[in-house]
Protein backbone atom coordinates (compact mmCIF):
# COMPACT_ATOMS: atom_id res chain seq x y z
CA UNK A 1 0.00 0.00 0.00
CA UNK A 2 1.19 3.25 -0.32
CA UNK A 3 -0.32 6.34 1.12
CA UNK A 4 0.55 10.21 -0.06
CA UNK A 5 -0.65 13.57 0.66
CA UNK A 6 0.63 16.51 -1.34
CA UNK A 7 1.46 18.78 -0.70
CA UNK A 8 3.22 16.44 2.10
CA UNK A 9 3.52 19.38 4.71
CA UNK A 10 1.79 19.01 8.01
CA UNK A 11 1.53 22.49 8.55
CA UNK A 12 0.32 24.89 5.54
CA UNK A 13 -0.06 28.39 5.05
CA UNK A 14 -2.56 30.30 1.88
CA UNK A 15 -2.91 33.53 1.37
CA UNK A 16 -6.30 35.02 2.16
CA UNK A 17 -8.18 34.99 -1.22
CA UNK A 18 -6.01 32.38 -2.68
CA UNK A 19 -6.70 28.98 -3.47
CA UNK A 20 -4.56 25.58 -2.85
CA UNK A 21 -5.59 22.15 -3.32
CA UNK A 22 -4.53 19.10 -1.30
CA UNK A 23 -4.58 15.88 -2.63
CA UNK A 24 -4.77 12.81 -0.55
CA UNK A 25 -4.23 9.37 -2.28
CA UNK A 26 -3.91 5.64 -1.79
CA UNK A 27 -3.07 2.71 -3.64
CA UNK A 28 -3.47 -1.28 -2.75
CA UNK A 29 -2.53 -4.22 -3.04
CA UNK A 30 -5.75 -5.66 -4.33
CA UNK A 31 -9.03 -3.86 -4.51
CA UNK A 32 -9.57 -0.33 -4.53
CA UNK A 33 -8.60 2.40 -1.73
CA UNK A 34 -11.25 4.13 0.17
CA UNK A 35 -10.33 7.78 0.57
CA UNK A 36 -11.79 10.52 2.67
CA UNK A 37 -11.13 13.94 3.99
CA UNK A 38 -12.98 14.72 7.07
CA UNK A 39 -13.37 17.98 8.86
CA UNK A 40 -11.88 18.14 12.54
CA UNK A 41 -12.11 21.70 13.90
CA UNK A 42 -12.68 23.38 10.14
CA UNK A 43 -15.42 23.45 7.64
CA UNK A 44 -14.28 21.51 4.86
CA UNK A 45 -14.87 23.93 1.80
CA UNK A 46 -14.82 21.51 -1.63
CA UNK A 47 -13.63 17.82 -1.72
CA UNK A 48 -13.78 15.74 -5.22
CA UNK A 49 -13.77 12.26 -4.15
CA UNK A 50 -12.96 10.00 -6.73
CA UNK A 51 -11.23 6.10 -6.39
CA UNK A 52 -8.49 6.01 -5.00
CA UNK A 53 -7.83 9.83 -4.24
CA UNK A 54 -10.16 12.76 -2.43
CA UNK A 55 -9.09 16.44 -3.32
CA UNK A 56 -9.64 19.37 -0.84
CA UNK A 57 -10.11 22.48 -2.30
CA UNK A 58 -9.14 25.50 0.15
CA UNK A 59 -10.62 28.53 -0.31
CA UNK A 60 -8.51 31.24 1.68
CA UNK A 61 -11.10 32.41 3.76
CA UNK A 62 -10.56 32.67 7.23
CA UNK A 63 -13.16 29.76 7.76
CA UNK A 64 -10.57 27.05 6.04
CA UNK A 65 -8.78 27.68 8.89
CA UNK A 66 -7.86 24.38 10.97
CA UNK A 67 -6.67 21.03 10.61
CA UNK A 68 -8.41 18.33 8.63
CA UNK A 69 -7.75 14.73 8.15
CA UNK A 70 -6.91 12.82 5.15
CA UNK A 71 -8.23 8.71 6.26
CA UNK A 72 -7.01 6.09 3.73
CA UNK A 73 -8.26 2.85 4.22
CA UNK A 74 -6.63 -0.71 2.31
CA UNK A 75 -8.35 -3.43 3.61
CA UNK A 76 -7.76 -4.07 7.22
CA UNK A 77 -5.37 -1.40 7.42
CA UNK A 78 -6.34 2.65 7.86
CA UNK A 79 -3.75 5.50 7.71
CA UNK A 80 -4.32 8.85 8.37
CA UNK A 81 -2.60 12.09 7.65
CA UNK A 82 -3.51 15.46 9.39
CA UNK A 83 -2.97 19.01 7.80
CA UNK A 84 -2.64 22.18 9.59
CA UNK A 85 -4.04 24.97 7.39
CA UNK A 86 -3.34 28.31 8.85
CA UNK A 87 -5.35 31.10 6.19
CA UNK A 88 -3.28 34.67 7.06
CA UNK A 89 -3.43 38.29 5.70
CA UNK A 90 -0.69 40.35 4.97
CA UNK A 91 -0.91 43.32 2.67
CA UNK A 92 2.19 45.60 1.69
CA UNK A 93 -0.29 48.41 4.12
CA UNK A 94 1.73 49.65 6.45
CA UNK A 95 1.19 53.67 7.30
CA UNK A 96 3.89 55.30 9.78
CA UNK A 97 3.65 58.04 11.41
CA UNK A 98 5.04 61.26 11.23
CA UNK A 99 6.14 61.25 7.79
CA UNK A 100 9.39 62.17 8.42
CA UNK A 101 11.95 62.78 11.35
CA UNK A 102 13.36 65.69 12.59
CA UNK A 103 17.03 65.95 13.65
CA UNK A 104 18.60 66.94 16.66
CA UNK A 105 15.25 66.50 18.66
CA UNK A 106 13.75 63.52 20.90
CA UNK A 107 10.65 61.90 19.15
CA UNK A 108 7.96 58.78 18.68
CA UNK A 109 7.88 57.07 15.78
CA UNK A 110 4.76 54.52 15.15
CA UNK A 111 4.14 51.94 12.39
CA UNK A 112 1.01 50.58 11.75
CA UNK A 113 0.38 47.40 9.74
CA UNK A 114 -3.37 47.36 8.30
CA UNK A 115 -5.30 44.24 7.77
CA UNK A 116 -3.72 42.02 9.27
CA UNK A 117 -4.39 37.82 10.14
CA UNK A 118 -3.68 36.56 12.57
CA UNK A 119 -3.00 39.19 15.19
CA UNK A 120 -0.95 37.12 17.12
CA UNK A 121 2.71 38.93 18.59
CA UNK A 122 4.24 35.24 17.93
CA UNK A 123 3.92 35.62 14.03
CA UNK A 124 4.15 39.39 13.78
CA UNK A 125 7.20 41.24 14.82
CA UNK A 126 8.04 45.18 14.34
CA UNK A 127 11.78 46.73 14.12
CA UNK A 128 12.87 49.64 13.36
CA UNK A 129 16.12 49.91 10.97
CA UNK A 130 18.93 52.26 10.56
CA UNK A 131 20.56 50.89 6.88
CA UNK A 132 19.93 47.08 8.02
CA UNK A 133 20.93 46.72 11.49
CA UNK A 134 17.83 47.70 14.24
CA UNK A 135 18.24 51.70 15.15
CA UNK A 136 20.00 51.21 18.61
CA UNK A 137 18.77 53.65 21.66
CA UNK A 138 14.91 53.23 20.23
CA UNK A 139 12.96 52.30 23.19
CA UNK A 140 10.19 49.98 22.44
CA UNK A 141 6.46 51.31 23.82
CA UNK A 142 3.76 48.31 24.43
CA UNK A 143 2.31 47.09 20.94
CA UNK A 144 -1.32 47.62 19.90
CA UNK A 145 -3.92 45.93 18.62
CA UNK A 146 -7.78 47.22 16.88
CA UNK A 147 -10.03 45.30 14.79
CA UNK A 148 -10.54 47.37 11.12
CA UNK A 149 -13.59 48.43 10.38
CA UNK A 150 -14.96 46.13 7.60
CA UNK A 151 -17.33 46.46 4.86
CA UNK A 152 -18.00 42.83 4.90
CA UNK A 153 -19.30 40.72 7.87
CA UNK A 154 -17.35 37.41 8.78
CA UNK A 155 -13.53 38.65 7.95
CA UNK A 156 -11.94 40.24 11.53
CA UNK A 157 -8.86 41.64 10.78
CA UNK A 158 -6.37 43.46 12.26
CA UNK A 159 -4.10 46.78 12.84
CA UNK A 160 -1.31 46.14 14.74
CA UNK A 161 0.47 49.50 15.93
CA UNK A 162 4.35 49.07 17.26
CA UNK A 163 5.95 52.63 18.64
CA UNK A 164 9.28 53.81 19.41
CA UNK A 165 10.57 56.40 21.74
CA UNK A 166 13.38 57.54 19.48
CA UNK A 167 16.73 59.17 20.83
CA UNK A 168 18.06 62.34 18.85
CA UNK A 169 19.02 61.60 15.92
CA UNK A 170 22.81 62.42 15.95
CA UNK A 171 24.59 64.50 12.94
CA UNK A 172 24.73 63.73 10.33
CA UNK A 173 21.34 62.38 10.42
CA UNK A 174 20.47 59.65 8.82
CA UNK A 175 18.52 60.09 5.61
CA UNK A 176 15.97 57.64 6.85
CA UNK A 177 14.75 55.07 9.43
CA UNK A 178 13.08 51.94 7.69
CA UNK A 179 9.92 50.43 9.71
CA UNK A 180 10.24 46.38 9.06
CA UNK A 181 7.01 44.35 9.74
CA UNK A 182 7.83 40.52 9.55
CA UNK A 183 5.05 37.84 9.80
CA UNK A 184 6.26 34.29 10.28
CA UNK A 185 4.55 31.14 9.30
CA UNK A 186 4.61 27.60 8.80
CA UNK A 187 7.76 27.37 6.55
CA UNK A 188 7.56 31.19 5.47
CA UNK A 189 8.43 34.56 6.22
CA UNK A 190 7.34 37.54 4.94
CA UNK A 191 8.66 40.75 5.04
CA UNK A 192 7.23 44.52 4.76
CA UNK A 193 9.24 47.83 4.88
CA UNK A 194 8.44 51.88 4.98
CA UNK A 195 11.08 54.27 4.89
CA UNK A 196 10.72 56.71 7.56
CA UNK A 197 12.62 60.26 5.73
CA UNK A 198 14.69 62.25 7.70
CA UNK A 199 14.67 65.98 7.06
CA UNK A 200 18.35 67.21 6.02
CA UNK B 1 -18.08 15.18 33.65
CA UNK B 2 -16.50 13.54 30.65
CA UNK B 3 -16.28 9.70 31.98
CA UNK B 4 -15.32 5.97 30.57
CA UNK B 5 -16.53 3.51 32.83
CA UNK B 6 -15.91 -0.21 31.41
CA UNK B 7 -17.28 -3.83 33.02
CA UNK B 8 -17.26 -6.87 32.35
CA UNK B 9 -14.36 -8.29 33.33
CA UNK B 10 -13.48 -11.60 35.49
CA UNK B 11 -11.77 -14.94 34.91
CA UNK B 12 -12.12 -17.35 32.20
CA UNK B 13 -10.77 -20.31 31.13
CA UNK B 14 -8.66 -20.32 28.37
CA UNK B 15 -11.13 -20.72 25.24
CA UNK B 16 -13.88 -19.10 26.52
CA UNK B 17 -15.50 -15.83 25.86
CA UNK B 18 -15.83 -12.82 27.69
CA UNK B 19 -18.20 -9.66 26.91
CA UNK B 20 -16.87 -5.93 27.98
CA UNK B 21 -18.72 -2.61 28.46
CA UNK B 22 -17.74 0.72 28.20
CA UNK B 23 -20.32 3.71 29.18
CA UNK B 24 -19.69 6.48 28.21
CA UNK B 25 -21.05 10.35 29.32
CA UNK B 26 -20.32 13.57 29.18
CA UNK B 27 -19.57 13.90 25.63
CA UNK B 28 -20.68 13.54 22.69
CA UNK B 29 -20.09 9.81 21.96
CA UNK B 30 -21.55 9.49 18.25
CA UNK B 31 -18.55 11.92 17.54
CA UNK B 32 -15.56 10.17 18.75
CA UNK B 33 -13.96 6.74 17.76
CA UNK B 34 -12.92 4.44 20.02
CA UNK B 35 -10.77 2.36 21.03
CA UNK B 36 -9.71 -0.80 23.00
CA UNK B 37 -6.26 -0.68 24.75
CA UNK B 38 -4.92 -3.55 27.20
CA UNK B 39 -1.95 -3.73 29.55
CA UNK B 40 -0.65 -7.17 30.45
CA UNK B 41 0.49 -7.25 34.20
CA UNK B 42 4.05 -5.62 34.29
CA UNK B 43 3.91 -4.75 30.23
CA UNK B 44 3.71 -1.86 28.36
CA UNK B 45 0.54 -0.63 26.16
CA UNK B 46 -0.89 -2.69 23.92
CA UNK B 47 -3.82 -1.10 21.04
CA UNK B 48 -6.76 -3.73 20.90
CA UNK B 49 -9.00 -2.44 18.59
CA UNK B 50 -10.72 0.98 17.54
CA UNK B 51 -14.41 1.71 15.68
CA UNK B 52 -15.19 5.20 13.60
CA UNK B 53 -17.48 7.53 15.24
CA UNK B 54 -20.40 5.71 13.15
CA UNK B 55 -19.38 2.40 13.76
CA UNK B 56 -18.80 1.77 9.86
CA UNK B 57 -15.05 1.06 10.03
CA UNK B 58 -13.49 -0.82 12.41
CA UNK B 59 -9.83 -2.11 12.48
CA UNK B 60 -7.97 -4.65 15.01
CA UNK B 61 -4.36 -5.79 16.37
CA UNK B 62 -2.71 -8.69 15.00
CA UNK B 63 -2.91 -10.76 17.82
CA UNK B 64 -6.46 -10.28 18.31
CA UNK B 65 -8.17 -10.50 14.71
CA UNK B 66 -10.72 -13.11 13.99
CA UNK B 67 -11.20 -13.74 17.98
CA UNK B 68 -12.57 -9.86 19.00
CA UNK B 69 -14.93 -7.43 17.74
CA UNK B 70 -15.35 -4.20 18.78
CA UNK B 71 -19.14 -2.64 18.09
CA UNK B 72 -20.82 -0.02 19.69
CA UNK B 73 -24.39 1.56 20.16
CA UNK B 74 -24.45 5.42 20.05
CA UNK B 75 -28.39 5.24 21.08
CA UNK B 76 -26.64 3.78 24.54
CA UNK B 77 -23.52 5.61 24.41
CA UNK B 78 -21.81 2.23 24.76
CA UNK B 79 -18.94 0.73 23.74
CA UNK B 80 -18.51 -3.11 23.34
CA UNK B 81 -15.60 -5.46 23.30
CA UNK B 82 -16.65 -8.97 22.36
CA UNK B 83 -13.49 -12.04 22.89
CA UNK B 84 -13.85 -15.24 21.62
CA UNK B 85 -11.25 -17.95 21.58
CA UNK B 86 -9.55 -16.64 24.95
CA UNK B 87 -5.81 -17.22 25.57
CA UNK B 88 -3.44 -16.78 28.98
CA UNK B 89 -1.66 -14.42 26.64
CA UNK B 90 -5.10 -11.69 26.78
CA UNK B 91 -4.76 -11.62 30.57
CA UNK B 92 -4.37 -7.83 30.84
CA UNK B 93 -6.09 -4.70 32.48
CA UNK B 94 -8.26 -3.70 29.68
CA UNK B 95 -8.97 0.07 28.84
CA UNK B 96 -11.50 2.00 26.81
CA UNK B 97 -10.23 5.12 25.52
CA UNK B 98 -11.78 8.01 23.05
CA UNK B 99 -10.32 9.38 20.27
CA UNK B 100 -11.26 12.57 17.60
CA UNK B 101 -11.60 10.80 14.19
CA UNK B 102 -10.52 7.58 14.88
CA UNK B 103 -6.81 8.14 16.45
CA UNK B 104 -4.77 10.93 14.87
CA UNK B 105 -5.06 12.96 17.59
CA UNK B 106 -4.52 10.82 20.59
CA UNK B 107 -6.46 9.40 23.14
CA UNK B 108 -7.59 11.94 25.12
CA UNK B 109 -10.10 9.98 27.91
CA UNK B 110 -9.09 6.95 29.51
CA UNK B 111 -11.55 4.63 31.49
CA UNK B 112 -10.23 3.14 34.58
CA UNK B 113 -9.68 -0.68 33.42
CA UNK B 114 -11.51 -3.62 33.68
CA UNK B 115 -9.00 -6.42 34.35
CA UNK B 116 -9.67 -10.26 32.15
CA UNK B 117 -7.58 -12.53 33.33
CA UNK B 118 -7.86 -16.01 31.60
CA UNK B 119 -6.34 -19.38 33.46
CA UNK B 120 -7.35 -22.57 33.82
CA UNK C 1 3.65 -2.54 10.80
CA UNK C 2 5.03 0.80 12.11
CA UNK C 3 7.49 0.00 14.92
CA UNK C 4 8.23 2.58 17.93
CA UNK C 5 11.58 2.55 19.63
CA UNK C 6 11.70 4.68 23.05
CA UNK C 7 14.93 4.92 24.89
CA UNK C 8 15.70 5.13 27.74
CA UNK C 9 13.87 2.54 28.87
CA UNK C 10 14.50 3.75 32.48
CA UNK C 11 16.21 6.61 34.10
CA UNK C 12 17.13 8.11 37.18
CA UNK C 13 16.62 11.73 37.74
CA UNK C 14 16.03 14.62 40.51
CA UNK C 15 13.33 17.17 41.06
CA UNK C 16 14.52 20.34 39.24
CA UNK C 17 16.23 17.75 36.37
CA UNK C 18 15.63 18.57 32.36
CA UNK C 19 14.57 15.11 31.49
CA UNK C 20 14.80 14.05 27.76
CA UNK C 21 12.79 11.46 26.14
CA UNK C 22 13.23 9.65 22.40
CA UNK C 23 10.77 7.96 20.14
CA UNK C 24 12.03 6.45 16.69
CA UNK C 25 9.79 5.33 14.26
CA UNK C 26 10.30 2.64 11.59
CA UNK C 27 9.00 4.54 9.09
CA UNK C 28 7.58 8.28 8.24
CA UNK C 29 4.62 9.20 10.30
CA UNK C 30 4.93 12.93 9.70
CA UNK C 31 3.59 14.30 13.07
CA UNK C 32 1.54 11.89 14.03
CA UNK C 33 3.23 11.05 17.56
CA UNK C 34 1.69 11.10 20.89
CA UNK C 35 2.97 11.04 23.96
CA UNK C 36 1.12 9.97 27.59
CA UNK C 37 2.03 9.29 30.75
CA UNK C 38 1.16 6.48 33.07
CA UNK C 39 1.43 6.22 37.13
CA UNK C 40 1.65 2.67 38.84
CA UNK C 41 -2.10 1.25 38.94
CA UNK C 42 -4.09 4.26 36.97
CA UNK C 43 -4.94 4.89 33.20
CA UNK C 44 -2.52 6.54 31.10
CA UNK C 45 -2.83 9.99 30.15
CA UNK C 46 -2.23 12.12 26.91
CA UNK C 47 0.33 14.61 27.73
CA UNK C 48 1.35 15.50 23.73
CA UNK C 49 -0.82 15.14 20.63
CA UNK C 50 0.54 15.14 16.74
CA UNK C 51 3.97 15.82 18.41
CA UNK C 52 4.00 18.97 19.58
CA UNK C 53 0.79 20.38 20.97
CA UNK C 54 0.35 20.31 24.53
CA UNK C 55 -3.24 18.20 25.34
CA UNK C 56 -5.32 21.21 27.61
CA UNK C 57 -4.78 20.69 31.65
CA UNK C 58 -1.07 19.84 31.00
CA UNK C 59 1.90 21.59 32.67
CA UNK C 60 4.07 23.66 30.12
CA UNK C 61 6.96 22.07 31.25
CA UNK C 62 5.95 19.17 28.96
CA UNK C 63 7.18 19.37 25.53
CA UNK C 64 7.09 17.41 22.14
CA UNK C 65 9.29 17.89 19.18
CA UNK C 66 10.22 16.04 15.82
CA UNK C 67 8.69 15.15 12.80
CA UNK C 68 8.99 12.38 10.02
CA UNK C 69 11.12 8.81 12.38
CA UNK C 70 12.58 11.12 15.43
CA UNK C 71 10.85 12.86 18.07
CA UNK C 72 11.23 14.15 21.89
CA UNK C 73 9.60 14.38 25.05
CA UNK C 74 10.63 16.99 26.95
CA UNK C 75 10.22 17.56 30.48
CA UNK C 76 11.85 21.18 31.67
CA UNK C 77 12.05 20.88 35.16
CA UNK C 78 11.08 17.58 37.24
CA UNK C 79 9.16 17.96 39.57
CA UNK C 80 8.12 14.91 42.41
CA UNK C 81 4.58 14.21 40.30
CA UNK C 82 6.09 13.48 36.90
CA UNK C 83 7.83 9.91 38.40
CA UNK C 84 5.96 7.64 36.32
CA UNK C 85 6.15 5.59 33.17
CA UNK C 86 6.15 7.54 29.65
CA UNK C 87 4.96 5.99 26.28
CA UNK C 88 4.82 7.43 22.89
CA UNK C 89 2.00 5.98 20.27
CA UNK C 90 2.06 6.15 16.50
CA UNK C 91 -1.48 7.28 15.05
CA UNK C 92 -0.27 7.58 11.29
CA UNK C 93 -1.76 3.77 10.25
CA UNK C 94 -3.29 1.02 11.83
CA UNK C 95 -2.26 -1.31 13.41
CA UNK C 96 -1.69 0.98 16.40
CA UNK C 97 1.59 0.79 17.82
CA UNK C 98 3.23 1.94 21.36
CA UNK C 99 6.92 2.57 22.23
CA UNK C 100 8.24 0.15 24.83
CA UNK C 101 8.06 3.06 27.91
CA UNK C 102 10.54 4.86 29.50
CA UNK C 103 10.41 4.80 33.71
CA UNK C 104 11.60 8.31 35.30
CA UNK C 105 12.37 7.35 38.89
CA UNK C 106 13.76 9.31 41.73
CA UNK C 107 17.43 9.40 41.74
Known amino acids: QSFQVNPPESEVAVAMGTSLQITCSMSCDEGVARVHWRGLDTSLGSVQTLPGSSILSVRGMLSDTGTPVCVGSCGSRSFQHSVKILVYAFPDQLVVSPEFLVPGQDQVVSCTAHNIWPADPNSLSFALLLGEQRLEGAQALEPEQEEEIQEAEGTPLFRMTQRWRLPSLGTPAPPALHCQVTMQLPKLVLTHRKEIPVLQ | EVQLLESGGGLVQPGGSLRLSCAASGFTFSSYGMHWVRQAPGKGLEWVAV????????YYADSVKGRFTISRDNSKNTLYLQMNSLRAEDTAVYYC?????????????WGQGTTVTVSS | DIQMTQSPSSLSASVGDRVTITCQAS??????LNWYQQKPGKAPKLLIYAASSLQSGVPSRFSGSGSGTDFTLTISSLQPEDFATYYCQQGYSTPLTFGGGTKVEIK
Open chain 2, 97 to 109: TTSKYYYYYGMDV
Open chain 2, 51 to 58: ISDDGSDK
Open chain 3, 27 to 32: QDISKS
